[in-house]
Interface confidence: low
Amino acid sequence: AVNGTSRFTCFYNSRANISCVWSQDGALQDTSCQVHAWPDRRRWNQTCELLPVSQASWACNLILGTPDSQKLTAVDIVTLRVMCREGVRWRMMAIQDFKPFENLRLMAPISLQVVHVETHRCNISWKISQASHYFERHLEFEARTLSPGHTWEEAPLMTLKQKQEWICLETLTPDTQYEFQVRVKPLQGEFTTWSPWSQPLAFRTKPAALGKDT
């Protein structure tokens, strides 16, 4: 970046999307900026329009193809540039050589559902979305359960160190409303980060049978 402090961060969802955020102190809010993607060994290139997400940061998604198409591999390098319009010209504000499989952030898990619920336990399953077949089974998950009277931030994290798309929650309180979220991360990639949390799944444990200890 030419003026101010610039930060340009991008993640690959492992299939056909690169999401980028560009932050620039002192940048003009009404400037038109784009992200340009130029792979080193492929015939396509792609552009997206940066849209403001806060006072000094912009974001956009490079859509490389249909959601489940494998557009990049572990060996691709994509040159990413932030280009901003200055009058009739475009000025390069930031650049990075982007290694997609070193900068992974998968889509949030989907299709959360209660498989079986009892008084003290609940079995929940989910599916991963738009995840590359290159990972094989090398994924890990984090899950959290929201209990009454607590916040998500207070919820303890449960770690699943393998590709396991289900969990059995134990020691729950009978006849109680809970919410559950899960996120996923590939084991591959130096700068890989967790996916966003899934949409919360609400469920209620069964009431304890009358006359039984709870």
């Epitope: 060994r41 494998q70 591999t73 572990a74 060996v75 077949h133 290159y134 094989e136 089974r137 090398h138 084991l187 591959q188």
Partner: antibody
């Protein structure tokens, strides 16, 4: 113990097809990719293609028009079919599996099956 | 395709000798492997990811290098090391092997 066992080799007429099987044990083909590599007599190794755990395939572009790799998860077996065979396809055909990660190299190999293309 | 060129094509050395094989890639590669193949046998993985020793492989075998230039070394040649050695890249498809280096005992 991880084992790969190829079968289906033998004599094939020029212009014919071959279908090889690779029976896996000690792991499941729904969890690991299986690759095919061949070696012509007195020659080096040549990578032909791979079937990933989810069933997707990547092929060597030199063979893509006449090569199909498939699998039967219930039998834990991977299949290799090549059409329009010619004399230069005479080789020992191996199936191989990487280590725990795709980039751990071919840690496990079958014993190989010889395919001879001749009239 | 990435071409992998090994040198020498063959070599003859005495037991206890240090043996070095080089592998040159036509373009930069990230993941390089070395295999040993004894006559009539399937290849055996010796080195993965350039310099890591595969399970059960003696420590006399080693690998190094980066970019386009890689080296495989047997620090002290043993009679059981008579074989052909191959390098292989796993940086882009198709995966490609070197043409092999045949190692014999003098």
């Amino acid at each position: 113990e991880v084992q790969l066992l190829e079968s289906g080799g033998g004599l094939v007429q020029p212009g014919g097809s071959l279908r090889l099987s690779c029976a896996a044990s000690g792991f499941t083909v729904t969890s690991y990719a299986v690759h095919w590599v061949r070696q012509a007599p007195g020659k080096g190794l040549e990578w032909l293609g791979v079937i990933w755990s989810g069933g997707s395939t990547d092929y060597n572009a030199a063979f893509i028009s006449r090569l199909t790799i498939s699998k039967d998860n219930s039998k834990n077996t991977v299949y290799f079919q090549m059409n329009s065979l010619r004399a230069e396809d005479t080789a020992v055909y191996y199936c191989a599996r990487a280590g725990d990660y795709n980039y751990d190299g071919f840690a496990y190999w079958g014993q190989g099956t010889l395919v001879t293309v001749s009239s | 395709d990435i071409q992998m060129t090994q040198s020498p094509s063959s070599l003859s050395a005495s037991v206890g000798d240090r043996v070095t094989i080089t592998c040159q890639a036509s373009q930069s590669v990230s993941f390089l492997y070395w295999y040993q193949q004894r006559p009539g046998k399937a290849p055996r993985l010796l080195i993965y990811d350039t310099s890591n020793l595969a399970s059960g492989v003696p420590s006399r075998f080693s690998g190094s290098g980066s970019g386009t230039s890689y080296t495989f070394t047997i620090s002290s040649l043993q009679p059981e090391d008579i074989a052909t050695y191959y390098c292989q890249q796993w940086s882009t498809y198709p995966l490609t092997f070197g043409q092999g280096t045949k190692v014999e005992i003098k």
